[in-house]
């Protein structure tokens, strides 16, 4: 049998059974999640579940810019440092930078400080670029 690789929406990129859309416009975390959901197909702010996935995403984004952080789907909804992926994925792989996670910072971003390979927490009302993900 010939197995066809699923296709992603125009402009979205494919990696290991998932499609990713990098939005170079500004949304707070909750508005970014709503915009991801608006594309259907079960799309959410992206979960990043392995170093390989993180590296692929980081390489892609670095082709566009290297200075602006990007929202991902990791948040702390209870504000108790109990982080979870908005798409329901298991929170096993972690790639936090060494920065303090205190204060009113309950949403996660890919940090530009380490070529988008590590995460930082930030205030959820900040307007930033964002990354969506769905399984086609």
């Amino acid at each position: 049998d010939i197995i066809m690789r699923p296709s992603c929406a125009p402009g979205w990129f494919y990696h290991k059974s998932n499609c990713y859309g990098y939005f170079r416009k500004l949304r707070n975390w909750s508005d970014a999640e709503l915009e991801c959901q608006s594309y259907g197909n079960g799309a959410h702010l992206a979960s990043i579940l392995s170093l390989k996935e993180a590296s692929t995403i980081a390489e892609y984004i670095s082709g566009y810019q290297r200075s602006q952080p990007i929202w991902i789907g990791l948040h702390d909804p209870q504000k108790r440092q109990q982080w979870q992926w908005i798409d329901g994925a298991m929170y096993l792989y972690r790639s936090w930078s060494g920065k303090s996670m205190g204060g009113n910072k309950h949403c996660a971003e890919m940090s530009s400080n380490n070529n988008f390979l590590t995460w930082s927490s930030n205030e959820c009302n900040k307007r930033q670029h964002f990354l969506c993900k769905y399984r086609p």
Partner: antibody, heavy 124, light 109 residues
């Protein structure tokens, strides 16, 4: 009230040089990216050059068709944007507008205020 | 990349007109689209920013939208007035590249 006032345009021969200025007022000039956009007579708008705020590195960007000939710069102490134009060609003839970024965060993408423009004519 | 607009559109006062702006590559939703109005002899003014936001002072007859399926943005002007007669330009960006559409001349008959 935001104001952008361009100057420095005029008639120049092919191969010549001009320096355009854009004096800004009514906003915190040093915090915003700025750009030059041109419009040839009877034609559409065409992006020329942009510069980010000093806080975002003061990076400069130029369209391919002016790369190496035009240089954008800023003097935050004077609230002034510049465009140094060298090796001018007939096809550079246009009204040159300066434009302010709408956001101090996401530099050099979209514009909210424009000046009235200054006309550059390249002809022998 | 390129942004393609119709060269001209015309409509009667009081009616609704829509001007399209189609992106030829990537996904138009990934970057903001902005719309400018330019009346004859004047510099451009912003009528829509961030895809669908109106600056203060722009009437709510002006609206912007994005359609990923057609990879296009649209500017819709309802309740047309003679003062709306002008050239309209869309604009977007990617990386360090800023692009304008070719412009659409709106004639209010």
């Amino acid at each position: 009230e935001v104001q952008l006032v361009e100057s420095g345009g005029g008639l120049v021969q092919p191969g010549g040089s001009l320096r355009l200025s854009c004096e800004a007022s009514g906003f915190s000039f040093s915090s915003y990216g700025m750009s030059w956009v041109r419009q040839a007579p009877g034609k559409g708008l065409e992006w020329v050059s942009s510069i980010t705020s000093r806080g975002r590195g003061g990076s400069t960007y130029h369209a391919d068709y002016v790369e190496g000939r035009f240089t954008i710069s800023r003097d935050d102490a004077k609230n002034t944007l510049y465009l140094q134009m060298n090796s001018l060609r007939a096809e550079d003839t246009a009204v040159y507008y300066c434009a302010k970024d709408w956001s101090a965060y996401d530099s050099v993408h979209l514009f909210d205020y424009w000046g009235r423009g200054t006309l550059v004519t390249v002809s022998s | 990349f390129m942004l393609t607009q119709p060269h001209s559109v015309s409509e009667s006062p009081g009616k609704t007109v829509t001007i399209s702006c189609t992106r030829n590559t990537d996904n138009i939703a990934f970057n903001y689209v902005q719309w400018f109005q330019q009346r004859p002899g004047s510099s451009p003014t912003t009528v829509i920013y961030e895809d669908n936001q109106r600056p203060s002072g722009v009437p709510d007859r002006f609206s912007g939208s994005i359609d990923s399926s057609s990879n296009s943005a649209s500017l819709t002007i309802s309740g047309l007035k003679t003062e709306d007669e002008a050239d309209y330009y869309c604009q977007s960006y990617d990386g360090n590249n800023l692009v304008f559409g070719g412009g659409t001349k709106l004639t209010v008959l």
